[in-house]
Amino acid sequence: MVPEEEPQDREKGLWWFQLKVWSMAVVSILLLSVCFTVSSVVPHNFMYSKTVKRLSKLREYQQYHPSLTCVMEGKDIEDWSCCPTPWTSFQSSCYFISTGMQSWTKSQKNCSVMGADLVVINTREEQDFIIQNLKRNSSYFLGLSDPGGRRHWQWVDQTPYNENVTFWHSGEPNNLDERCAIINFRSSEEWGWNDIHCHVPQKSICKMKKIYI
Amino acid sequence: LGEPQLCYILDAILFLYGIVLTLLYCRLKIQVRKAAITSYEKSDGVYTGLSTRNQETYETLKHEKPPQ
Amino acid sequence: LGEPQLCYILDAILFLYGIVLTLLYCRLKIQVRKAAITSYEKSDGVYTGLSTRNQETYETLKHEKPPQ
């Protein structure tokens, strides 16, 4: 026979057991709480620092772009691509049609003040998108020039000039003194490029990379 | 670690914790039920507690000296 | 709802579930122990408590004095 336990020992044993179990419960709940807090606070700080970064990034642009239109890129809430509000977006770029008439150099300077360049057209799709926003009776400067007058055309952003991806009107370029390129509409050939004098005031198209925040 | 990744890791931890605890809870519940049935069947006999062969989780952590 | 928001909602649910289950489990554990002691007291002197082979969860954290 097993000797009988004293009632107070049994009480004490139960009390110890309860203490152990509830201690473990508290420890488990504390661990869960720590995990949960870390999950809530760290991302919050992460979001906060990300927001601070975004705000400082936005502040850079604010002087010339008081408002941006942003869209969420993909599924991730962190990645937003923005264009200044009056600008239109296509693929990874933003476009702005400037209706003020200015020389090529002044047009390029105006674009650069806005963090952009005169438009560099890399594909037929890009040109097709751009022309949707143009008026047929106007001409618009491109970011393409030949300052030396030796037919060494160059894009303002140093993109290599590729003869295979050009959309000159037939017979153009045709004048060594005409060192800047425009895009305009000709009824026979639709939209295409033409060389003109750089000092002649024209409308222009600015292009900038989307702002990622 | 990025914000969503951290959340997913925590999800996994909580999920596993939940599963383990659910299993333990169910197991304990079943044992209690079994013990109650056994107790009822053996109520004219001596043994009315939990089955002698029942081994709880973590049993091997410490070898307890059996009662003398 | 976006993907990250869903993750946080799931986190909260799992967190609450974990807490509730922890409490329930501990409560049940104590009930089992109490039941065992009660069963022992009612068994006219014969030891019919938990099996000598039975080791409870986490029991081993403290060396318990065996019943004399």
């Epitope: 200015q102 390029q108 045709n174 004048n175 003194d177 000092h199 005031p201 | - | -």
Partner: antibody, heavy 121, light 111 residues
Framework: EVQLVESGGGLVKPGGSLRLSCAAS????????MSWVRQAPGKGLEWVST????????YYPDSVKGRFTISRDNAKNSLYLQMNSLRAEDTAVYYC??????????????WGQGTTVTVSS | DIVLTQSPASLAVSPGQRATITCRAS??????????MHWYQQKPGQPPKLLIY???NLESGVPARFSGSGSETDFTLTINPVEAEDTANYYC?????????FGGGTKVEIK
């Protein structure tokens, strides 16, 4: 040798008209943009109008827009300035000048001797 | 329009001395490495004659004592050493955009 010779100046009443000519020689006239620049007595130089080499582009300052017309005849190596509705402030020596392009702009490398236009009643 | 302001309006220099004329534009007349300011000399009773193009390039046939410098809005024409035959009016001109404009002129006299 490059030569630019202006003609057609004279005395004219306010509201009257004159047509100035500039005969070019010694270079391929059709390859160059041309301009008219004037100088009022005792004053500085003032640009009056420009025409591109291919006749595709003409430009005027606001002071003469709608009154003056620049034109060229590449076959005759000649540059013209038709001046209508003349005013007293149009009194000046009128020079024709050849444009040379340099990067994104141009300068005037050769000038004629000038022809004098006097608008007076 | 781009306004060009020349200074001084007149200048008297002894032969062998240096004469410096400045031209300030109301806005930049440079684009990257191109500085689109030009200088002309006009002697009494004669048409203007090109001296310097592109801010610092000496036109062929112009004596090396003439030199030009500057960028953006501030440009300088230097005659060093000045000679008696340099008595004339000097004009700066820009044509980076239409209308092309001239400075008001600087009259250089030899003492």
């Amino acid at each position: 040798e490059v030569q630019l010779v202006e003609s057609g100046g004279g005395l004219v009443k306010p509201g009257g008209s004159l047509r100035l000519s500039c005969a070019a020689s010694g270079f391929t006239f059709s390859s160059y943009g041309m301009s008219w620049v004037r100088q009022a007595p005792g004053k500085g130089l003032e640009w009056v109008s420009t025409i591109s080499s291919g006749d595709s582009y003409t430009y005027y300052p606001d002071s003469v827009k709608g009154r003056f017309t620049i034109s060229r005849d590449n076959a005759k190596n000649s540059l013209y300035l038709q001046m209508n509705s003349l005013r007293a402030e149009d009194t000046a020596v009128y020079y024709c000048a050849r444009q040379i392009y340099y990067d994104y702009a141009y300068y005037f490398d050769f000038w004629g001797q000038g022809t004098t236009v006097t608008v007076s009643s | 329009d781009i306004v060009l302001t020349q200074s001084p309006a007149s200048l008297a220099v002894s032969p062998g001395q240096r004469a410096t004329i400045t031209c300030r534009a109301s806005e930049s007349v440079s684009f990257r490495t191109s500085h689109l300011m030009h200088w002309y000399q006009q002697k009494p009773g004669q048409p203007p004659k090109l001296l310097i193009y592109g801010a610092s390039n000496l036109e062929s046939g112009v004596p090396a004592r003439f030199s030009g410098s500057g960028s953006e809005t501030d440009f300088t024409l230097t005659i060093n050493p000045v000679e008696a035959e340099d008595t004339a009016n000097y004009y700066c001109q820009q044509s980076i955009e239409d209308p092309p404009t001239f400075g008001g002129g600087t009259k250089v006299e030899i003492k």
